[in-house]
């Protein structure tokens, strides 16, 4: 069986301030079991944007229904974009672990650029 890949098809996304950004991500397999998380930036200082496993993220909605057990679409929408939201967003698959889940594979990243509202 082929190893799971995390696919972020869009290298760049440009969104006007105040609009909604759609960041696309799909996985090629349901295995291994474990959640998806979205981060802005890479490395130890990266910012958590969405965690499938925990919490409620009011600005973020999932494009598809992640409660459906065969779902492999982990795309998200981020509402009311501001220039502070610019950056590179990574969709990261975690493998279920004990006590903590383990990072398994990351997408290549999507760079979000924010265009100022025309005055």
């Amino acid at each position: 069986e082929e190893e799971l890949q995390v696919i972020q098809p869009d290298k760049f996304v440009l969104v006007a301030a105040g609009e909604t950004a759609t960041l696309r991500c799909t996985a090629t397999s349901l295995i291994p079991v474990g959640p998806i998380q979205w981060f802005r930036g890479a490395g130890p200082g990266r910012e958590l944007i969405y965690n499938q496993k925990e919490g409620h993220f009011p600005r973020v909605t999932t494009v598809s229904d992640l409660t459906k057990r065969n779902n492999m679409d982990f795309s998200i929408r981020i509402g009311n974009i501001t220039p502070a939201d610019a950056g590179t967003y990574y969709c990261v698959k975690f493998r279920k672990g004990s006590p903590d889940d383990v990072e398994f594979k990351s997408g290549a990243g999507t760079e979000l650029s924010v265009r100022a509202k025309p005055s």
Partner: antibody
Framework: EVQLVESGGGVVQPGRSLRLSCAAS????????MIWVRQAPGKGLEWVAS????????YYADSVKGRFTISRDNSKNTLYLQMNSLRAEDTAVYYC?????????????WGQGTMVTVSS | AIQLTQSPSSLSASVGQRVTITCGAS??????MHWYQQKPGKAPKLLIY???NLEAGVPSRFSGSGSGTDFTLTISSLQPEDFATYYC?????????FGQGTKLEIK
């Protein structure tokens, strides 16, 4: 077999405290968010509080905020509800339930409940 | 908080009858609406999750539909064990909320 067993209910005077426990077995407790839901006699269901799998995210109903504290001990497979400053309107059967993964998931298993009666 | 309104509040029906219960939300909950069955003195049991998905082990006579603000639970042919109270519940945003319940009684 998944089991959730609540304990700690009883009769308590207004203003006093009580701690409920929910012992979990038959599943990997640390994978699941957990919830307390209550049901006053003859009434419907009311969500009370929820806690994420690693305790990073905690939410309360407005009716209990500042009085109740939800917590969990993953090493003991146990969920808790500390109830302070109890009022007559807190009288209810308290159920614990589990929720797989994130906030949007349903409550797929429930305990049988423990009765809390607040009365002078 | 999102308010959920179930209709009807109570319903008398006969074995074999088709029954529909509706749940309306005060704002969109997308598809994050779930349905539970509760029998007297027992804990609620999950029937349908995310509007239309049948929980494992639940008979196929139960079905759900809807999205946004309007949802429906249908029992295609009532069985004696289906007489109970049914609740809808949303998980789109905190606080979680339940409908007031629909009591299904034998006619």
């Amino acid at each position: 077999e998944v089991q959730l067993v609540e304990s700690g209910g009883g009769v308590v005077q207004p203003g006093r405290s009580l701690r409920l426990s929910c012992a979990a077995s038959g599943f990997t407790f640390s994978d699941y968010g957990m919830i307390w839901v209550r049901q006053a006699p003859g009434k419907g269901l009311e969500w009370v509080a929820s806690i994420s799998s690693s305790s990073s995210y905690i939410y309360y109903a407005d009716s209990v905020k500042g009085r109740f504290t939800i917590s969990r001990d993953n090493s003991k497979n146990t969920l808790y509800l500390q109830m302070n400053s109890l009022r007559a309107e807190d009288t209810a059967v308290y159920y614990c339930a589990r929720r797989y993964y994130g906030f949007n998931y349903p409550f797929d298993y429930w305990g049988q409940g423990t009765m809390v009666t607040v009365s002078s | 908080a999102i308010q959920l309104t179930q209709s009807p509040s109570s319903l008398s029906a006969s074995v074999g009858q088709r029954v529909t219960i509706t749940c309306g939300a005060s704002k969109s909950v997308r598809t994050y609406m779930h349905w539970y069955q509760q029998k007297p003195g027992k804990a609620p049991k999950l029937l349908i999750y995310s509007a239309s998905n049948l929980e494992a082990g639940v008979p196929s006579r139960f079905s759900g539909s809807g999205s946004g603000t309007d949802f429906t639970l249908t029992i295609s042919s009532l069985q004696p064990e289906d007489f109970a109270t049914y609740y809808c519940q949303q998980s789109n945003e905190p606080p979680y909320t339940f409908g007031q319940g629909t009591k299904l009684e034998i006619k």
